[in-house]
Interface confidence: low
């Protein structure tokens, strides 16, 4: 069997919302993968999970399953989202994240997935790490790529 | 220790412009926001705008938006207001002062001043 | 723009008496991070204005504790208890939620 190639594109896109009383933010992050079938026969994508860390902490996690199958020497794109939520210790987060005279809202997260695929019985797991940049202050819709290249706040440590 | 040194005073000629500078020392001159105050003679504070010396970001007061114009260098950590087309309207104490900006502006707003430069306009 | 109301131009007011000085603002400065985004500043005889307290409560760095900050998403004290001879001057409240930023008209302490 040839490869199955996994590609993490990046953000799509990132929709906010913030609890007062709780001080808390919640994050929609919808993300993009390329999966191509470099082999003459069809796959099927099982499951995707995916996490998403800020400053070391898991703040979202989201799993989806029986999601596709891709045709032999095939691509597909696939949008997945991940509600994740920064609360408690990280409450420091949500003056920053909301307050008008901050000029740049961008955190940077760790965006983990994991693409299962099966074909003729057979499992095979790919996983990828990538930091990515995101704005919590606003909704925003990302350019393919764009959020790998922003301004971003180091997490305090 | 954190400074922002203005000089005292400058008499200007009415329709002239002046450009005035605000000297920080003490700190990280790119990390802060730098504003602007005008204060008339027997009146109160009114804000004219604020600059980013990182990027030069700014912000004005639209009442000051043809009058004012906020520049900084970077180089030699000195943020300037030029004010234009002066008139005795436009005679009065003008303040820096900074505060915390960029990522970390959590409201410890203008904790810094500067002693203020007189402007006098006048033939 | 957002209009800061300081009501009361002058208050006369004896050495160790408390004081409070009033400001009113036209929109709730409660922002919705929980934070009240209000300052109150000294201007005292001839020279700059000092920070007196940032986020509506918190004293800044330096100010004796005599000073307090208090109130609601739209109407604020300044309570200064003991006045002393050197708390004389205009008391500016400002409001940073909003641009343009906004001061109030003052508030002129004197000693009787």
């Known amino acids: 069997p040839r490869s199955i190639d996994v590609k993490y594109i990046g953000v799509k896109s990132a929709y906010v919302s913030y609890d007062v009383q709780k001080r808390t933010i919640y994050l929609n992050i919808t993300n993009t993968l390329n999966i191509t079938n470099n082999n003459y026969y069809s796959v099927e994508v099982e499951n995707i999970t995916a996490q998403v860390q800020f400053a070391k902490t898991v703040i979202g996690k989201a799993r989806l399953n029986n999601i596709t199958h891709i045709g032999p020497l095939d691509m597909k794109q696939i949008d997945y989202t991940v509600p994740t939520v920064i609360a408690e210790e990280m409450s420091y987060m949500y003056d920053f994240c909301t307050l008008i005279s901050i000029k740049v809202h961008n955190i940077v997260l760790m965006m983990q997935v994991t693409v299962t695929t099966t074909y003729f019985g057979h499992s095979e797991q790919i996983s990828q790490e990538r930091y990515q940049y995101v704005d919590c202050g606003r909704n925003t819709t990302y350019q393919l790529g764009q959020s790998e290249y922003l301004n971003v706040l180091q997490p305090q440590q | 220790q954190v400074q922002l040194q203005q000089p005292g005073a400058e008499l200007v000629k009415p329709g002239a412009s002046v450009k005035l500078s605000c000297k920080a020392s003490?700190?990280?001159?790119?990390?802060?926001?730098m504003h602007w105050v005008r204060q008339r003679p027997g009146q109160g504070l009114e804000w004219i705008g604020n600059?980013?010396?990182?990027?030069?970001?700014?912000h004005y007061n639209h009442k000051f938006k043809d009058k004012a114009t906020l520049i900084v260098d970077k180089s030699s950590s000195t943020a300037y207001l030029q004010l234009s087309s002066l008139t005795s309207e436009d005679s009065a104490v003008f303040y820096c002062?900074?505060?915390?900006?960029?990522?970390?502006?959590?409201?410890?707003?203008?904790?810094?001043w500067g002693q203020g430069t007189s402007v006098t306009v006048s033939s | 723009d957002i209009v800061m109301t300081q009501a009361t131009p002058s208050i006369p007011v004896t050495p160790g008496e408390s004081v409070s000085i009033s400001c009113r603002s036209s929109?709730?400065?409660?922002?919705?991070?929980?934070?009240?985004?209000l300052f109150w500043f000294l201007q005292r005889p001839g020279q700059s204005p000092q920070l007196l307290i940032y986020?509506?409560?918190n004293l800044a760095s330096g100010v004796p504790d005599r000073f307090s900050g208090s109130g609601s998403g739209t109407a604020f004290t300044l309570r200064i208890s003991r006045v002393e001879a050197e708390d004389v001057g205009v008391y500016y409240c400002?409001?940073?939620?909003?641009?343009?930023?906004?001061f109030g008209s003052g508030t002129k302490l004197e000693i009787k």
């Open positions: 600059i980013d010396p990182s990027d030069s970001d700014t």
């Open positions: 986020r509506m409560s």
């Open positions: 003490g700190y990280t001159f790119t990390n802060h926001w």
């Open positions: 400002m409001q940073h939620l909003e641009y343009p930023f906004t």
């Open positions: 002062a900074r505060s915390r900006g960029g990522y970390y502006d959590y409201g410890e707003a203008m904790d810094y």
């Open positions: 929109k709730s400065l409660l922002h919705v991070n929980g934070n009240t985004y």
